[in-house]
Amino acid sequence: AESHWCYEVQAESSNYPCLVPVKWGGNCQKDRQSPINIVTTKAKVDKKLGRFFFSGYDKKQTWTVQNNGHSVMMLLENKASISGGGLPAPYQAKQLHLHWSDLPYKGSEHSLDGEHFAMEMHIVHEKEKGTSRNVKEAQDPEDEIAVLAFLVEAGTQVNEGFQPLVEALSNIPKPEMSTTMAESSLLDLLPKEEKLRHYFRYLGSLTTPTCDEKVVWTVFREPIQLHREQILAFSQKLYYDKEQTVSMKDNVRPLQQLGQRTVIKS
């Protein structure tokens, strides 16, 4: 049987054979992959990149959250959507997950001018069906998925908006465990609206196998701030394995080459 994919840290600290990032299959060896380092001064301003419109993001809900063995994932089940932001159509929210380390300098997947952040939050959306502009695009869409990526850094205050998620982590230490979060809205997790005006945009891939190259990425310039203990909770409470021997951390794909692609900014 073929080994399952994993992160480098899992291979280093477990006896189970698994495929580390350099050996990931599927589309993962192609040339339009994510994440990337964004050189902020090289990104050209594009006037078409306007503000985002968030629908359902403000609604208080009791979200299901699970440990899927790779990250912690909130199931959004089309209960929210986005439009604007230079996107070609509305996109429905599917899931939210995060990437992190146990140190402040290396938990994000994307980097800005070579700098990594403590964490990175991805809100994954799918394009509403029947909204592709032509047949070619409908068959081979490079923007079927829209991911909003938020960098996370340490601040001095507890971020109350994240507390329902952070508090739920204790209930899902092992893979395949799920729980219900205390009532919260997606908006609670985001920076204030004025901080969402500045972002970077490029076309890339999913950052986990099968690394499909059908993602329109939005990486926001302004980071979310979480308290130290909120950030550390992710690596302290969650495990990759059912035996709870390998702490979930460093679930970060290495940077990929930008190649011929361009990054634009709002």
């Epitope: 402040p104 300098y105 990594h116 850094e153 001095t156 308290h227 130290r228 203990e229 690596s235 951390k249």
Partner: antibody, heavy 119, light 107 residues
Amino acid sequence: DVQLVESGAELVRPGTSMKMSCKASGYAFTNYLIEWIKQRPGQGLEWIGVINPGSGGTHYNEKFKDKATLTADKSSSTAYMQLSSLTSDDSAVYFCAREGDYGSRADYWGQGTTLTVSS
Amino acid sequence: QIQITQSPAILSVSPGERVSFSCRASQSIGTRIHWYQQRTNGSPRLLIKYASESISGIPSRFSGSGSGTDFTLSINSVESEDIAVYYCQQSNSWPTTFGAGTKLELK
């Protein structure tokens, strides 16, 4: 009261290794990162690296990654730094410090360990 | 990595005078600068965090200001116990870096 107490001064031969310690008290050891900083005589401060005592995760200044190895023992609330292949350039005072915010300033410092490398 | 420049290297003052230390970063770092005092044969002591935030137990004569690339630490009435080297440190980008320090001495 938060305290970081470092091991005593050491005189060692070139080419050898040595391990210094930093015992923490007065706070939850696993909740704060421990940094190590080098200060050569009459010189400024140079950041060596950092350890998360809760997980053992480390991060090094590129300049020191082949020189220093950071470890921590949760049971004794003690952080350690091993320095290898010592030369006269390694003669310095080495401080451990607690990182006050995650990835930020050092709010409490040890008294320093003086290392002299000489034949 | 971000370079931190402190000036002047040495400051000579009389007790009771107001004194200011300058710290300049090679690129904008918001307010992520911290100031330390190191007396002879002692350990650094945190005086000011995030450019202007005071630290419990530090005398009120110490204050900080600035943002972006230019920062200042001030002592509004120098006392003899303030004789020390003063360092600034940036925590905006890894690896964190310190200035070379400014030595405060009495005239």
